[in-house]
């Protein structure tokens, strides 16, 4: 099946201190390689979360990503602050060999608006 990365929500609004879910689904797990969430675009984009075993405070995967056929790579961000505002991208990579992993497709992005409590 052809790979497609889908972020269904163009934007979400969340009150400061609350949590929000950023949805991301894939149509294929191939080629093998990690899925990562970034805020922003270009060389200055910020890595927010990687589904590769690293622990990140305040961020959890929504589904059981240890299922070998899992295609849901949504994340929950808890205790949101104004600094979390921005556009978040779910990005699928193909594994690298000696070179770094290669980005092959990105979702369309979800903008997070943080509202004052």
């Amino acid at each position: 099946k052809e790979l497609k990365v889908t972020q269904p929500e163009k934007s979400v609004s969340v009150a400061a201190g609350d949590s929000t879910v950023l949805n991301c689904t894939l149509t294929s797990l191939l080629p093998v390689g990690p899925i990562r969430w970034y805020r922003g675009v270009g060389p200055s984009r910020l890595l927010i979360y990687s589904f590769a075993g690293e622990y990140v405070p305040r961020i959890r995967n929504v589904s059981d990503t240890t299922k070998r056929n899992n295609m849901d790579f949504s994340i929950r961000i808890s205790n949101v602050t104004p600094a979390d505002a921005g556009i978040y991208y779910c990005v699928k990579f193909q594994k690298g060999s000696s070179e770094p992993d290669t980005e092959i497709q990105s979702g369309g992005g979800t903008e997070v608006y943080v509202l004052a409590k």
């Epitope: 797990l29 191939l30 080629p31 093998v32 990690p34 589904f51 590769a52 075993g53 059981d64 990503t65 240890t66 299922k67 070998r68 056929n69 594994k95 060999s97």
Partner: antibody, heavy 118, light 107 residues
Framework: DVQLVESGGAVVRPGESLRLSCAAS????????MSWVRQAPGKGLEWLAG????????YYIDSVKGRFTISRDNSENSLYLQMNSLTAEDTAVYYC???????????WGLGTLVTVSS | ALTQPASVSANPGETVKITCSGG??????YGWYQQKSPGSAPVTVI????KRPSDIPSRFSGSASGSAATLTITGVRVEDEAVYYC???????????FGAGTTLTVL
């Protein structure tokens, strides 16, 4: 420190059943997929079965499908392998292993010996 | 099936390369496991093609390219004598497979 300790190995007769256990400690067991791997005498390693962190999804090699069942109890930090209709070919050391994010293995138990003999 | 040489030998200080072929680059991740004696617990020396656990010496490294993976031991030591198994996880079939193992002898 991550620790995996298998138990339940025994000498059994062909056709009998056995349940192996693996007690996990030193990590958040409920966050990791787990696998069983065995090694027959004088042979190499053979992956048998894997289970997702939540326990809902299981995976088997064809040769044990229908005879072996992998399961887990996250409240007890324990992994299990139920083995039915055992044959001499199932004689091996059985290891439990913790899976990495991409379903390879990072930590292994010391193993438990299963001998099937009449 | 994953194919690796049955045995390799080297003198202390030399560089050893053990290859593992038969996987599909598109769908396979590789790992390498050291077993010092039959029936003893395997030790992971490389997972995810090239990731070395923190307690494994830096002389062990891994790479993967095309349909093969390679374990390299740079400056091999006597204590590295063991059987080394490669394993693959195939994201197409959801199945793990081991190679038959390579016996490393340090002369």
């Amino acid at each position: 420190d991550v620790q995996l300790v298998e138990s339940g190995g025994a000498v059994v007769r062909p056709g009998e059943s056995l349940r192996l256990s693996c007690a996990a400690s030193g990590f958040t067991f409920s966050s990791y997929a787990m696998s069983w791997v065995r090694q027959a005498p004088g042979k190499g390693l053979e992956w048998l079965a894997g289970i997702s962190a939540g326990g809902s999804d299981t995976y088997y090699i064809d040769s044990v499908k229908g005879r072996f069942t992998i399961s887990r109890d996250n409240s007890e930090n324990s992994l299990y392998l139920q083995m039915n209709s055992l044959t001499a070919e199932d004689t091996a050391v059985y290891y439990c292993a913790r899976e990495t994010w991409n379903h390879l293995f990072d930590y292994w138990g010391l193993g438990t010996l299963v001998t099937v003999s009449s | 099936a994953l194919t690796q040489p049955a045995s390799v030998s080297a003198n202390p200080g030399e560089t050893v390369k053990i290859t593992c072929s038969g996987g599909d680059w598109y769908s396979t991740y590789y790992g390498w496991y050291q077993q010092k004696s039959p029936g003893s617990a395997p030790v992971t020396v490389i997972h995810s093609d090239d990731k070395r656990p923190s307690d494994i010496p830096s002389r062990f490294s891994g790479s993967a390219s095309g349909s093969a993976a390679t374990l390299t031991i740079t400056g091999v030591r006597v204590e590295d004598e063991a059987v080394y198994y490669c394993a693959g996880y195939d994201g197409r079939t959801y199945i793990n497979t081991f190679g038959a193992g390579t016996t490393l002898t340090v002369l």
